[in-house]
Amino acid sequence: EEELQMIQPEKLLLVTVGKTATLHCTVTSLLPVGPVLWFRGVGPGRELIYNQKEGHFPRVTTVSDLTKRNNMDFSIRISSITPADVGTYYCVKFRKGSPEDVEFKSGPGTEMALGAKPSAPVVLGPAARTTPEHTVSFTCESHGFSPRDITLKWFKNGNELSDFQTNVDPTGQSVAYSIRSTARVVLDPWDVRSQVICEVAHVTLQGDPLRGTANLSEAIRVPPTLEVTQQPMRVGNQVNVTCQVRKFYPQSLQLTWSENGNVCQRETASTLTENKDGTYNWTSWFLVNISDQRDDVVLTCQVKHDGQLAVSKRLALEVTVHQKDQSSDATP
């Protein structure tokens, strides 16, 4: 006959308050004759949780039918778990005897601990926007989890990031823990549509991690490039000048025209288009009346983007019969 082994497969069982916990125990032999009992703790002060032989245990039920002879499963379910139920539970075989049954063999024990799921991660970006090629910091926070062991990863557009620092508090024993992680992300010009993701994995989540996201569109400022051009064809006594503001983000933009240093209100038309990468283009047309115009007309397109210092581009207007020659220069 095979020597009796008491098998408790789980070293740790995480349970949630109010739920039912299943403590597993199987035996490899039915000998010696005698009952199987469950205890919490060890030594003289151990607490009887379930006795196959006798007693009333209203919160405990057996997983299998213990009246079946070939049953080797002595697992139990404990309902309505409370924080007072935490501890290490032992499945113990006794040999029938008098005046008391004699403890024969104990299982290795299963530690029951209260598991608390982490809160949904909250990702916060920088307070101010930053231009591409610079580094910005994102923080991720999740709270209220237990046990302390937790895994946090950062991703940018699905690619795992490595430049981050993570802290779990408190360092000592606690009912619940918090995690805070700061990731450093280098901004690319095309990051308007990018996302950073903070992923938290915890034993209570059963392999289904929680994710928090932040859009880099909240953190990036892509400054515009300006180009001012004179249209080659005259329309009567008017010349059409175009200011093209390209690849900027966010959309917030103020454009003003100046003629020989004097601010004009005569913007004829403008269009805003969105690029595939999420940046914008703005095109403004300005009609210059050249009927009484001298040769030295300088037009300036000035753009103030997202509250930053204005940038401008100048164009010296060439009024010739064929309007072939165009020249321009930029001033910051």
Epitope: L30, P35, S98
Partner: antibody, heavy 118, light 107 residues
Framework: EVQLVESGGGLVQPGGSLRLSCAAS????????MHWVRQATGKGLEWVSA???????YYTGSVKGRFTISRENAKNSLYLQMNSLRAGDTAVYYC????????????WGQGTMVTVSS | DIQMTQSPSSLSASVGDRVTITCRAS??????LAWFQQKPGKAPKSLIY???SLHSGVPSKFSGSGSGTDFTLTISSLQPEDFATYYC?????????FGQGTKLEIK
């Protein structure tokens, strides 16, 4: 249905032998401790012998060396070989199944009568 | 061997009565005590094991108690089918031994 049916009883002379059989149905006999209990006419119950699941055997003092308990798993049957029978062995012999974890008797056969008389 | 002593040896009672039979072991048997009911010409029937646990199908009017050396069987309200002989048995160690029986008769 769980059932035990004894057979093999009868009249035998003192010093003679008998082999009692117990056919089990509805369960696997080898998974249980099995017992023989006897009852003389008008008397109380007396435990006679047992065989454990591991094949270990036990006897009451008055039958030790004379009776042998055994089982045949293929036939799901229990036996009691009784030799050197005495008048004091006259009784109804019951085949009894021991309980699941503590060996408390739970299923009894209907009994078979053994009479030892010249 | 462990000696089992039942009392009384016989008992007369009426239908509806509550009766108690006691069983004493010569040494501590923990709670490995069983009770059986036997009617004339029939095999015994298992009623109670581990002193107080009812076998499947046994009506709840039967109850057992005790531990160590002193045990009782109580029948809460006697019915005609309950008049029989009752035996206690210790099964903590071999040889298993029975009490001499208590015959419950109709008054």
């Amino acid at each position: 249905e769980v059932q035990l049916v004894e057979s093999g009883g009868g009249l035998v002379q003192p010093g003679g032998s008998l082999r009692l059989s117990c056919a089990a149905s509805g369960f696997t006999l080898s998974s249980y401790d099995m017992h023989w209990v006897r009852q003389a006419t008008g008397k109380g119950l007396e435990w006679v012998s047992a065989i454990g699941t591991a094949g270990d055997t036990y006897y009451t003092g008055s039958v030790k060396g004379r009776f042998t308990i055994s089982r045949e798993n293929a036939k799901n049957s229990l036996y009691l070989q009784m030799n050197s029978l005495r008048a004091g062995d006259t009784a109804v012999y019951y085949c009894v199944r021991g309980g699941v974890w503590d060996d408390a008797f739970d299923i009894w056969g209907q009994g078979t009568m053994v009479t030892v008389s010249s | 061997d462990i000696q089992m002593t039942q009392s009384p040896s016989s008992l007369s009672a009426s239908v509806g009565d509550r009766v108690t039979i006691t069983c004493r072991a010569s040494q501590d048997i923990n709670n490995y005590l069983a009770w059986f009911q036997q009617k004339p010409g029939k095999a015994p029937k298992s009623l109670i094991y581990t002193a107080s646990s009812l076998h499947s199908g046994v009506p709840s009017k039967f109850s057992g108690s005790g531990s160590g050396t002193d045990f009782t069987l109580t029948i809460s309200s006697l019915q005609p089918e309950d008049f029989a002989t009752y035996y206690c048995q210790q099964y903590v160690s071999y040889p298993y031994t029975f009490g001499q029986g208590t015959k419950l008769e109709i008054k």
